[in-house]
Amino acid sequence: MQKGDQNPQIAAHVISEASSKTTSVLQWAEKGYYTMSNNLVTLENGKQLTVKRQGLYYIYAQVTFCSNREASSQAPFIASLCLKSPGRFERILLRAANTHSSAKPCGQQSIHLGGVFELQPGASVFVNVTDPSQVSHGTGFTSFGLLKL
Amino acid sequence: MQKGDQNPQIAAHVISEASSKTTSVLQWAEKGYYTMSNNLVTLENGKQLTVKRQGLYYIYAQVTFCSNREASSQAPFIASLCLKSPGRFERILLRAANTHSSAKPCGQQSIHLGGVFELQPGASVFVNVTDPSQVSHGTGFTSFGLLKL
Amino acid sequence: MQKGDQNPQIAAHVISEASSKTTSVLQWAEKGYYTMSNNLVTLENGKQLTVKRQGLYYIYAQVTFCSNREASSQAPFIASLCLKSPGRFERILLRAANTHSSAKPCGQQSIHLGGVFELQPGASVFVNVTDPSQVSHGTGFTSFGLLKL
C-alpha cells in the first residue's frame, strides 16, 4: 500500500486474550496468526494499538460473545471502537449493539466494526465492551486491527 | 494502492453460488458485480481465492444464512475464514458465530468477517460454514474478497 | 495509499443522520469524527457518496437498528449497499438481513457490509434499509464510507 522507506506498509491484526481484569477494555496479544508490520504500529499494554504516523487508517474489530437474556442486564451487549488522541479525551469512533439471546446457557453472536479515520501521531485505538466476561476467545472469534491507507 | 507494473492493484470480490456438494466449504463465482483485478489473484475450483504474490492482504467474507433453532443442531451457525498455505495445514484466520433464530420457518442473519493477514505466494483462502444449506444466495447477501495492501 | 498529486488518497466516512423523510435511503452527514479526504469523493444530498475517479474501492456500511418481531412486518430488516453508475440503473452491491428480535420494546442488532468494487467516474453509492425508523443514530452506531485502493 505504501512502498519504499518513505512509505512503509503499516498494518496490525491482534488476537483476543482472556483477562482477569474487570476493565471493560478488551485485551489483545501478538499470538496465533497475528500481524504487526513494523514498529510504526504497536500493541501497548495489551489493550491498544498505537500509531506513530499521521494519516488515514482503516480500523476494524470483531467481537464474538455468548450471552443469555435472563442472565444479563436489560441493556444490550455493546462493542465500541474508541480513540485516544494525544492531549484529547477518549472518543467513540464506532459502536455495535446486539440484544442478548434467549438460548441457554448462552447464545453466541458476532459483531464487526470497521471504518476509515484520521489518526494523529501517538493516537491509540482500543475496544470496549459492556461485559468482557461474555467475550469468546476461541481461535478467530475476536480480533482487532488496522491498516494505513 | 499499488501503482505501476511492479505494483499492480490486487483485489477480488466474488459472489456466492449454491452448490449440490455436501462440503462445508462455500462455493463462489465470478458473476454479477464481481471484481477480479488481474491474474495475481484467482478463484480456484470455485472455492478458494489464491494469490501469487507474498504480502499483506485485507481479507473479508460476508455470509447471510437462514436457520431455525428447532430445525438446527444445538451448535450455533459458524462461518470460518480459513487459510491454506503451501505445504501447511489449513488454519482458521477468523470465525463468527450466531445462534439460530426462533423465527419460522427460519430467521435470517448476516455475519461479516475481515482482517489483515500475511499471505505467501500460492496461499489460498476459503470460507467454511457449519451448514451450507442454510446460506442465502440472493443478490448481495453472501460474498468473499480480498485486497492487497 | 495513493501518494503525490497524481495519486491522492481518496477516502470518506460519514455519520448517520435521523431524517423525517419517509425514503428508505439512509441520510448521512459530515459531522462528529467524519472523514472526507478531498473533493475526489463527496457526500451528495446527504444520501450518497460520489467519486470522481475510476478505480477499485473498498466500500462499507454499518447499520444498527432496534426492532421487535411483533411490531414489525414478517420480513427481516435488510440493509443494502447500492450503486448508481452514470447512465445505468441502480444495482445492489451488498445486502445483509437480520430477523427482528423478540426483545421488548425492541432489540438492537448491528449489520456490517463491506466489499471491493470497481466504480466509474461519477458513480454514487448509497445505503437502503427496509425501515429507516428503526435505525439507531447514537454516536458510532451507524456509518458509511469508502476508500480507494
Epitope: - | T23, S24, V25, S80, C82, P86, G87, R88, F89, E90, R91, I92, G122, N128 | -
Partner: antibody, heavy 118, light 107 residues
Amino acid sequence: QVQLVQSGAEVQKPGSSVKVSCKASGGTFSNFAFNWVRQVPGQGLEWMGRILPSLDIASYAQKFQDRVTITADKSTSTAYMELSSLRSEDTAMYYCAREVDGGGFDYWGQGTLVTVSS
Amino acid sequence: DIQMTQSPSSLSASVGDRVTITCRASQGISSWLAWYQQKPEKAPKSLIYAASSLQSGVPSRFSGSGSGTDFTLTISSLQPEDFATYYCQQYNSYPFTFGGGTKVEIK
C-alpha cells in the same frame, strides 16, 4: 509409539462400496491430517485425499472426487475412507498415512487390500 | 495438477555405492517435498521431508537437497537393506502427487 492400524482385507462386487478404517494411536489425533493413498498391484502410489480432523476439512483428488468420502471420528481416533461405485480397476492396496503440518507423511498404516470382482 | 517426474525409473548398484535419484516438479513447490522408501509387500516408509530434513530414526546416509523444481535424494553408501523402490512426493498443493518411483536393484 505411533501406530496406524487399518481394517482387514475386503472382497467387493462391482458397483458396491467399501469403507476402510484407520485407527491411530501414539499421538494427539487432532494434531495431524490423515491421507489415503492407493497402489494398484505392480504400480506406483496414488493420492486419493485427506482429512484434517481439527477443522473437519476433507480434500480430494479430482479423479476420486465423486466417489470417495473421507471422514474422521475424533472420539475413537479413527479415519475412514469410503469408495463407492467400485469397479475392477479399484482393486488395490489402500494405505492411510499420517501427515505432520509442513512435514509430509511420517507414518503409514499396514495397508488394506480391496479386491473388486464379480 | 503438479506432475512429479523421477529419474531414473530403475538403477542397478552395488553395496557401498553412492546413489543419486532426481525428482523434477512441473512447477515450483518451494521445499515441500518428501521422499519415501517402499519394500515389496510393505507399506512406504518416510525418509525425508521438507526436501532435506531427515525423518527421525532414518540413517544419516540418506540425504535430500533441492528447492523449487529440482530435487535429489542421495544414499552416500548403499547398504543391503536399501534395495527398494523410492518415491518423491510434493505436498505443496492439492492434489498431492507422487513421482513414478525409482527401483534400486542389486548389480
